[in-house]
Interface confidence: low
């Protein structure tokens, strides 16, 4: 168990011409917030695949309003760290995705509007318990500076937070800097002493005397930036033309570790630290079983025919893929009505409505009935961008303000006489006809072609139409 921590130092326009002056649109002030997403391994995963190691959302930053003619500043950022707790082992290799979101605070129908401003993706190797790693990334015209680290919690130790130390109930007999560690009940374990001179900032060790380098650093003491000239290398023969030391082949050159394993040099050889689900000298053996928890997003893992076998994931609604790693594109169902723009934010769907529409799915037409009243008991019907009134009987017109003569359309058939009534109209039928509109002839024998008139109602009596 442990926590991944991300500290955003600055976000602003990158160097060079064409850099944006402001993150806000012309509609007014805005504020920024960040989303961090962690995915296991070093894979080129699809952007929409879930954050299997976890995700976190920052608070909203201070409101920013563009100052005309002022130099474009680094933008005001939310306070505090972004923290992503992890429950299982820290995988060592991971993909880090940082998204910068803009929240527009202008007069938006249906609340503030969100839009993704920048997204950076880094595939990294990182040991838990190491120092902060710093990074600068460009995303389009924006530049993001940040630091990150993984640290163990809840008595876990080691670069993967897999070894558990438990405090003794009895007072410790060990000196300062030593920690009691299970299962060594009566002994104490010192944090390993790294190779002399191993960079405190860029190196770490699990075993005494070793010096493993963090991403971007190299050399036996992790003091050489990986991108610098090989003249600073410390291995291999000298080159007569440059006076440089030309690096000779090292055990980890070409990374012999397969499947995203990380390589560390041992005297005359190498050692692979394999990601979960792989083992073997070079992490070449794919041994993923249900015990490894390969099904993401609550998928049900079904094993094969024996404990050593592969697995099949049965995915819950909303997810697909062999590991339930892909979220079904809920926007493909077009849930936003009236031309609204669908945004799948992961935790929820959001519809950005066109002007004149509102509601969770843009189902309300604000132009239709807002502030419009239908007179004389009429009801307003939305649709088509213009309101329409459904009028009570006896009224008509756009707003039901006009009196309507229910008898004007001559509704009584076969010479029946029409009378206007408070609740509609009444037809007085001519002899030989019956029905609410005098539509049914009465046969000479007194039996109609349809079922007989109700008791007490004789043909020719007026029948009120309700």
């Amino acid at each position: 168990a442990g926590v991944f921590e991300l500290q955003i130092h600055s976000f602003g326009p990158g160097p060079g011409p064409g850099a944006p002056r402001s993150p806000c649109s012309a509609r007014g002030p805005c504020r920024l917030f960040f989303r961090v997403c962690l995915k296991p391994g070093l894979s080129e995963e699809a952007a929409e695949s879930p954050c299997a190691l976890g995700a976190a959302l920052s608070a909203r930053g201070p409101v920013y309003t563009e100052q005309p003619e002022a130099p474009a500043p680094d933008l005001p950022l939310p306070n505090g760290l972004l923290q992503v707790p992890f429950r299982d082992a820290w995988p060592g290799t991971f993909s880090l995705i940082i998204e910068t979101w803009r929240e527009e605070l202008g007069d938006q129908i249906g609340g503030p509007a969100w839009s993704l401003l920048a997204r950076v993706t880094r595939r990294r190797r990182l040991a838990a318990g190491g120092p902060w790693a710093r990074d600068i990334q460009r995303a389009g015209a924006w530049e993001l500076r940040f630091s990150y680290r993984a640290r163990c919690e809840l008595l876990a130790v080691g670069t993967a937070c897999t070894r558990l130390c438990r405090p003794r109930s009895a007072p410790s007999r060990c000196g300062p800097g030593l920690r009691p560690c299970a299962p060594l009940e009566d002994e104490c374990e010192a944090p390993p002493v790294c190779r002399a001179g191993c960079s405190l900032e860029h190196g770490f060790c699990e075993q005494p005397g070793e010096c493993r380098c963090l991403e971007g650093w190299t050399g036996p003491l992790c003091t050489v930036p990986a991108s610098t000239s090989s003249c600073l290398g410390l291995r291999g023969p000298s080159s007569a033309t440059t006076g440089c030391l030309v690096p000779g082949p090292g055990p980890c050159d070409g990374n012999p570790c397969a499947n995203g394993g990380s390589c560390s040099e041992t005297p005359g050889s190498f050692e692979c630290t394999c990601p979960r689900g792989f083992y073997g000298l070079r992490c070449e053996v794919s041994g993923v079983t249900c015990a490894d928890g390969p099904c993401f997003n609550g998928g049900l893992c079904v094993g094969g025919a024996d404990p050593d076998s592969a697995y099949i994931c049965h995915c819950p609604p909303g997810f697909q893929g062999s590991n339930c790693e892909k979220r079904v594109d809920r926007c493909s169902l077009q849930p936003c009505r009236n031309g609204g723009l669908c945004l799948d934010l992961g935790h929820a769907l959001r519809c950005r409505c066109r002007a004149g529409f509102a509601g969770p799915r843009c189902e309300h037409n604000l132009d239709d009935c807002a502030g419009r009243a239908c007179a004389n008991g009429g009801t307003c019907v939305e649709g088509g961008g213009a309101h329409r009134c459904s009028c009570a009987l006896g009224f008509g017109g756009r707003d039901c303000r006009e009196r309507a003569d229910p008898c004007a359309a001559r509704p009584c058939a076969h010479g029946g006489r029409c009378y206007a009534h408070f609740s509609g109209l009444v037809c007085a039928c001519a002899p030989g006809y019956m029905g609410s509109r005098c539509e049914f002839p009465v046969h000479p024998d007194g039996v109609s072609a349809l079922p007989a008139a109700p008791p007490g109602l004789r043909p020719g009596d007026p029948q009120r139409y309700l």
Partner: nanobody
């Protein structure tokens, strides 16, 4: 696009043998290939699997009778099935597991194996 083409299925008497082949194409970063089977009315189950390095495992019911092998140059995996019995009847599916994190499974269309007594 990953494609798997199975061949070699058919009908055989109990005690007989068959050799299934599965040719794969259109992928990178192969981790392992496998044969699964599904008997009528039953769940699909793993029969055997082989990793790129040659590591194999088998279902308990086929150990000693079935042998999985591969030809990496031809991107093909084989399942040699000996001492077949009626319980081995079913659809046999080839599967390939690929990707840097071995998280993507692709399946063939399946091939029918029928063992009569």
């Amino acid at each position: 696009q990953v494609q798997l083409v199975e061949s070699g299925g058919g009908s055989v008497q109990a005690g007989g043998s068959l050799r299934l082949s599965c040719a794969a194409s259109g992928y990178t970063d192969r981790c392992s290939m496998a044969w699964y089977r599904q008997a009528p009315g039953k769940e699909r189950e793993l029969v055997s699997r082989i990793s790129t390095s040659g590591f194999t495992n088998y279902a308990a019911s086929v150990k000693g009778r079935f042998t999985i092998s591969q030809d990496n140059a031809k991107n093909t995996v084989y399942l040699q099935m000996n001492s077949l019995n009626p319980g081995d009847t079913g659809m046999y599916y080839c599967a390939i597991i690929v990707g840097r994190t071995c998280s993507l499974n692709y399946w063939g269309n399946g091939i029918l194996v029928t063992v009569s007594s």
